[in-house]
Interface confidence: medium
């Protein structure tokens, strides 16, 4: 058993038929020595008298808040949530495998620069009674501070017959230092509780494994007199890492046509304009990558032809 | 050429020669992300890899106020990456394909760091650690490990010679 | 035109509350970070809060600590400060200030709203 | 948290007069330090950012340098709109926190 936060205590059961269980001492959190009763949640039963109360927890009606009174007065409480193991693996109940870039991949987490800053977000069908706190820290035998907001709500969809919630936290790196090569990992660290079950997710990586840029911005095309051909051309996105002479990055110019079936002409360049053909009724699209280390390309900004 | 005195490196030649490295890093191992490395215990093997380090002058400021430090840093980096390299690590079994580009990526660092140190001049380089896996799959997995190292190694020096480059060159 | 206004400042008791809001113009809101400053009658300038771009992270002095809340509605180009609990020494005007994106020069705060004064008295 | 001391806390000097002003950080910050200028009842201007680079606008005659610790805020000729009280402020990590101020006036 261990405690969470004031008053929470997390208790890790090996999850198996006829499993033993733990037994569990609560304490009463008062100078009382006598007349002090325990209950369970809302139940009025009394489960036990004295300033300690001995149980064993083997199954989710074994958790939940135990509350020590005396004479009508509630003296303290202390909540009880399980974390599963079984077959020595804990349980993964609450979030949603999302399967990319691998299996087992709960957390998902992207940097739009080198500025320290990262957001992770998850996936789940459950939708009440579920709250989730996140800690971050640059390497893990000697952490560095990185600052988490609150883990919020950010997305609701429709999947066949379920409904899926994603959530989503912003992190800042302390003090981050865009220029050096990374050599020790972000940690991050989710603890979510649903009901009465605990469990903990953790992602670590480096900052430049997690970079994607937003698209160029102001994408524009110019006609070339007498010519099919146009000047296509686009700028930095304004959230990418500076000086652009520093951070740099290499773009990939796309000429799709309506169908999906057409082919594609597609053009790498280190530049920020390029001259291609363009066909009627196709668009014209730019991403970007960093130009020094393949992490991911942007989402494409697109223009059409006519 | 940057001489342990101080004088400037042949930033437009370094530069290009960086971007060569990137590229040829990243053909040698591609595959990011289909096997996270650090899940298998690296610290005995790239924790000695020198690491370009926040006060190590490599950032836009530090270039402006005096490059040498960040291109000695840069310098002691390519000279490692280039022992082992040529080391039984990469060398040994199993051979890798004749059409690899590991052996353009070693020729490559050594060039460049030519470029940055001419014959006659020394700067400090750093010790590489013995590292002379006995099995051939922990031979593949430090590899795959040193690429992946290397790849974040160039990155930051292919920045850092972009930006000389661009702002610094005379 | 580049700008930041402040309004919400006032007079309030000691213990009570006051919501302060910023309304920026001329430049996209949504990409910056932003800042709360106070400068307290005849003394320097105090940090106060900042928040993210997208308002998922906040930062706060000790000095405020679970007392102020700084939100932001980028729909409305507004930034906000939520005063709870104050203080005789909250007594200040309160500047919202924009931060500079370029990450080397940081948070840098390059532009400044026109303050707003907040007293607390009884 | 690391503190930020300015000095002198106020100094007097002719118009034409190099002016410097020191910025002391109890810790190293790099050359995340950003100069700001207030003038009396108005509303604080950035002057110089990352230590020496100057805010597009601002007259030449300021100027930053330092690095770690040690910074300086320098006016090459001193000119009578520069009369204001001058703030260092720090910026590597949260809190973000300015000098004490320096206080600038015409002999």
């Known amino acids: 058993i261990w405690e969470l936060k004031k008053d929470v205590y997390v208790v890790e059961l090996d999850w198996y038929p006829d499993a033993p269980g733990e037994m569990v001492v609560l304490t009463c959190d008062t100078p009382e020595e006598d007349g002090i009763t325990w209950t369970l949640d809302q139940s009025s039963e009394v489960l036990g008298s004295g300033k300690t109360l001995t149980i064993q927890v083997k199954e989710f009606g074994d958790a939940g808040q135990y509350t020590c009174h005396k004479g009508g007065e509630v003296l303290s409480h202390s909540l009880l949530l399980l974390h599963k193991k079984e077959d020595g693996i804990w349980s993964t109940d609450i979030l949603k495998d999302q399967k990319e870039p691998k299996n087992k991949t709960f957390l998902r987490c992207e940097a739009k620069n080198y500025s320290g800053r990262f957001t992770c977000w998850w996936l789940t069908t459950i939708s009440t009674d579920l709250t989730f706190s996140v800690k971050s820290s640059r390497g893990s035998s000697d952490p560095q501070g990185v600052t988490c907001g609150a883990a919020t709500l950010s997305a609701e969809r429709v999947r066949g017959d379920n409904k899926e919630y994603e959530y989503s936290v912003e992190c800042q790196e302390d003090s981050a230092c865009p220029a050096a090569e990374e050599s020790l990992p972000i940690e991050v660290m989710v603890d979510a509780v649903h009901k009465l079950k605990y469990e903990n997710y953790t992602s670590s990586f480096f900052i430049r494994d997690i970079i994607k840029p937003d698209p160029p911005k102001n994408l524009q095309l110019k006609p070339l007199k007498n010519s099919r051909q146009v000047e296509v051309s686009w700028e930095y996105p304004d959230t990418w890492s500076t000086p652009h002479s520093y951070f740099s990055l290499t773009f990939c110019v796309q000429v799709q046509g309506k169908s999906k079936r057409e082919k594609k002409d597609r053009v790498f360049t280190d530049k920020t304009s390029a001259t291609v053909i363009c066909r009627k009724n196709a668009s014209i699209s730019v991403r970007a990558q960093d130009r020094y280390y393949s992490s991911s390309w942007s989402e494409w900004a697109s223009v059409p032809c006519s | 050429r940057a001489v342990p005195g101080g004088s400037s490196p042949a930033w437009t030649q370094c530069q290009q020669l960086s971007q060569k490295l990137c590229t040829l890093a990243w053909s040698a191992h591609p595959l990011v992300g289909h096997m996270d490395l650090r899940e298998e215990g690296d610290e005995e093997t790239t924790n000695d890899v020198p690491h370009i380090q926040c006060g190590d002058g490599c950032d836009p400021q530090g270039l402006r106020d005096n490059s040498q430090f960040c291109l000695q840093r840069i310098h002691q980096g390519l000279i490692f990456y280039e022992k082992l390299l040529g080391s039984d690590i990469f060398t040994g079994e199993p051979s890798l394909l004749p059409d690899s580009p590991v052996g353009q990526l070693h020729a490559s660092l050594l060039g460049l760091s030519q470029l940055l140190q001419p014959e006659g001049h020394h700067w400090e380089t750093q010790q590489i650690p013995s590292l002379s896996p006995s099995q051939p799959w922990q031979r593949l997995l430090l590899r795959f490990k040193i690429l992946r190292s290397l790849q974040a190694f160039v990155a930051v020096a292919a920045r850092v010679f972009a930006h000389g480059a661009a702002t610094l060159s005379p | 035109e580049v700008q930041l206004l402040e309004s919400g400042g006032g007079l309030v008791q000691p213990g009570g509350s006051l919501r302060l809001s910023c309304a920026a113009s001329g430049f996209t809101f949504s990409k910056y970070d932003m800042d709360w400053v106070r400068q307290a009658p005849g003394k320097g300038l105090e940090w106060v809060s900042s928040i993210s771009s997208s308002g998922g992270l906040t930062f706060y002095a000790d000095s405020v600590k679970g007392r102020f809340t700084i939100s932001r509605d980028n729909s409305k180009n507004t930034l906000y400060l939520q005063m709870n609990s104050l203080r005789a020494e909250d007594t200040a005007v309160y500047y919202c200030a924009r931060h500079d994106y370029d990450f080397w020069s940081g948070h840098a705060f390059d532009i400044w709203g026109q303050g707003t004064m907040v007293t607390v008295s009884s | 948290d690391i503190q930020m001391t300015q000095s002198p806390s106020s100094l007097s000097a002719s118009v034409g007069d190099r002016v410097t002003i020191t910025c002391r950080a109890s810790q190293g910050i790099s050359n995340y330090l950003a100069w700001y200028q207030q003038k009396p009842g108005k509303v604080p201007k950035l002057l110089i950012y990352?230590?020496?680079t100057v805010q597009s606008g601002v007259p030449s005659r300021f100027s930053g340098s330092g690095s770690g610790t040690d910074f300086t805020l320098t006016i090459s000729s001193l000119q009578p709109e520069d009369v204001a009280t001058y703030y260092c402020?720090?910026?590597?990590?949260?809190?973000?926190?300015f000098g004490q101020g320096t206080k600038v006036e015409i002999k």
């Open positions: 402020q720090k910026y590597n990590r949260v809190p973000w926190t």
């Open positions: 990352g230590a020496s």
